[in-house]
Interface confidence: low
Amino acid sequence: KLTIESTPFNVAEGKEVLLLVHNLPQHLFGYSWYKGERVDGNRQIIGYVIGTQQATPGPAYSGREIIYPNASLLIQNIIQNDTGFYTLHVIKSDLVNEEATGQFRVYPELPKPSISSNNSKPVEDKDAVAFTCEPETQDATYLWWVNNQSLPVSPRLQLSNGNRTLTLFNVTRNDTASYKCETQNPVSARRSDSVILNVLYGPDAPTISPLNTSYRSGENLNLSCHAASNPPAQYSWFVNGTFQQSTQELFIPNITVNNSGSYTCQAHNSDTGLNRTTVTTITVYAEPPKPFITSNNSNPVEDEDAVALTCEPEIQNTTYLWWVNNQSLPVSPRLQLSNDNRTLTLLSVTRNDVGPYECGIQNELSVDHSDPVILNVLYGPDDPTISPSYTYYRPGVNLSLSCHAASNPPAQYSWLIDGNIQQHTQELFISNITEKNSGLYTCQANNSASGHSRTTVKTITVSAELPKPSISSNNSKPVEDKDAVAFTCEPEAQNTTYLWWVNGQSLPVSPRLQLSNGNRTLTLFNVTRNDARAYVCGIQNSVSANRSDPVTLDVLYGPDTPIISPPDSSYLSGANLNLSCHSASNPSPQYSWRINGIPQQHTQVLFIAKITPNNNGTYACFVSNLATGRNNSIVKSITVSASGTSPGLSAGA
C-alpha cells in the first residue's frame, strides 16, 4: 500500500522536511503532490511525468520544493504556514489512480527565556515572590529548576499560568537558591540564566562565644557575638544594661572581679527592622595560689611507717585532687583520703610507693597542679646474694666473692669466715687459696637508717679432688607428652667439665635433649615413657673425676587404650564370665566396669557366674590415671546363647 512518511514529523522553522514515499507502484505514468488532504488543482505543488522526466510546478509551488524520481518531496526553509497535510497522487500506466496522504508540524526555534520577579528583596516568613518565565510562547511547555534540581514538592510552591509563573509563599532563608526556567517545544529547549533569590531574614537570637562564663582575674575578656542575618546584623554591647560599643567583638584587657556582671549582645537588621538580644553572665574569680605538698615523714621505713601528704594551702569550698605516677589514685586499702580530700595517707609504705605524687586544686575553670613530690622510702636490706654461685674451688686459684642486698640507703657489708669477722667491704678477695680456706662464708648486710641486718651463708670447699656430684631435678614426676624436665649436676665448680650418661651410655642425639649452662644442665623436652631411664652426671678436671649416683626418671603416662581378655565375644548360657582389663599406665590406673551403661564394680577383673542370655550387651572397661588426669575406655559386646543351640561357643571358665 502506498504510504507517506514525514522525516522529521516535527520540523523547526528554517529547517527542511522530506516526505518519503513507500511502496511506490511499478509502471507509472506520473505523479503529483498537493497541499492538503485531497487532490485539488488549485493546491497542486508540483507534477512529474516519467516518460518526459518533466516536472511542472503548480499553483501552490513556493520554490522551496524539490521532487525526486522516487516521488519523495523535499521542502526546504520550512515556514510556520507549511504545517499540515500533503497528498501524493499517482497515475499508473493503465491510468489507474492511487493516493496517499502524509503530514508534518512546524514549530518555531525558541528564544532563550529570562525570569522576571515581582519582589527582589522578600522578607522571611512575610513576603511571597512570583517568578515569571519570559517571553510567553505558544505551544511551549514551561519547566522550573531550583539549584539545577527539579522543583521539590512543597505546599509553599505553586505553579500557575500554564506553569509559566512560579510563586513561593512565605519565603524562608532556605529559599535562597538559584532559580532557572526552561521553555520546551517539540523542536527545541532553552534554559534561562540563574536568578538568585535574596531573602532578607533575621537577626536570629545571637550566640556569644566563647561559651565559658568563668574567668581569672588578670585575664583578657574577648567576647564575640554572631547572629544569622541577611543583610549582616549590626551589633551593640551592653554591660549591666549600660551601652558599651557598636562592634561584633567586645575586648576588655586585664579584667578584675569588678568586671563580673551581665553582658548583653544586641543584633539589628536594618532591612527587616528587627532586633534580637542574648545575655551571658560573666564571673571573674581571684587568682588562687599554686598548691604544694607537705609530708609528715620525709624518710618513712618500709612496712613500718605511714605517711600523710597534705595539699597546701587550705582553701574553703575547694576540691582537692591527687595523682600518683601521673595517674589518678588507684583503689587500695593502703591509700586513705581525708574527708576534704586534702590529706592523702599511705598506710605501711613499701618501696614501690616512691611516687611521684601531685595534688591539684579544682575550681570553676580547671585544675592547678602542684610540683611533684617523691618519697624517700627506707627499706631493706633484703637477703643478700653472694656471687658467683660456685661452691667448689681448686687450690691455688683466687677466691673473689661479691655480696649484694637491695636496700635504701645502700647497705653496709661485712664478711665473716666460720663466724670470724674479716672485713667491712662488699667484696671479699683471697688469693692463692688452699684447703684451709674451706669453710662457712657469711655476708652480713646492714641498713644504718632502719637498723635492720640480714645475712647469707655460703659453704666453700677448696679441694684438689672433685666431690661426688649429685643430680637435682625441677620435676620429679613429669607427665608424658606434656612436661619438660631439667636435670642439674651439683655442685657448680670452677674449671670443671660436666658429662652425662643415660643407662650407662653417652647421650643419644635427639632434638628433645638439650645441654646448657656449660653442660651442667640437661633438659628433656616433651618427655615420653621411654625417657624413664637411669641418668648419671659426671664432673672432671685436670686432676680428678667423679660420677653421681644414678637418678631414674619417673615418667607419668597413660592410661593407654585398655585391652579386655579373653578376646571371646560369644558364650553359652550357664558358663562363667571372667573378663580382665589391662591398660599401660604409670602409676597403675583405677579400673571400673559398666554393663549396658550401668556402673558395676571398681575392679580390674569382672566375674559373673552362670551367665544367661539376660547377660547379653555391651561391657565397657574404664581406666583413669589420677596423676596424669587422663582417662580411657574400651567397649566389648558379649552374646550369650542358650545351651546347645550353636556350636563353637565358649564354655566359659
Epitope: Y215, R216, G218, L365, D368, H369, P372
Partner: nanobody, 117 residues
Amino acid sequence: QVQLVESGGGLVQPGGSLRLSCAASGFTFSSSYMSWVRQAPGKGLEWVSGINTDGSFTRYADSVKGRFTISRDNAKNTLYLQMNSLKSEDTALYYCAVGGGLGYGPRGQGTLVTVSS
C-alpha cells in the same frame, strides 16, 4: 610586667609536625609551672599540656597524649611544644600560660595552628 610571646604556628597538612615556642620575661620562669592551652574556633579554652619547674614531670590531655611533647629551657626562659601527627581537630589558637592551665595566670597573645589538606 609579665610577657609571653608565642611563635611557630602556621598551616600544616594532616600528619605533619610543628614546634611552638614561648619566650617568657618579667617573672621568675625557672620557678614557675608552665602550661600550653588552646582555643579552637568557636570553642572554649582547652588545657593541652603542663610541665614542672625543672622539666622532670610532664602531663598531657588525653586528646594529644603520644603526639605532643612539652619541654622547657630555663637558661633561655623558653617553653616548647613539639606537635607531631597533627589532625584537623588540632586547629586552634595556642597560648602558653603561667600555672596549671585555663585561666591560671597570664597568657600570651597566642599563635595560630591550622591543620588542613
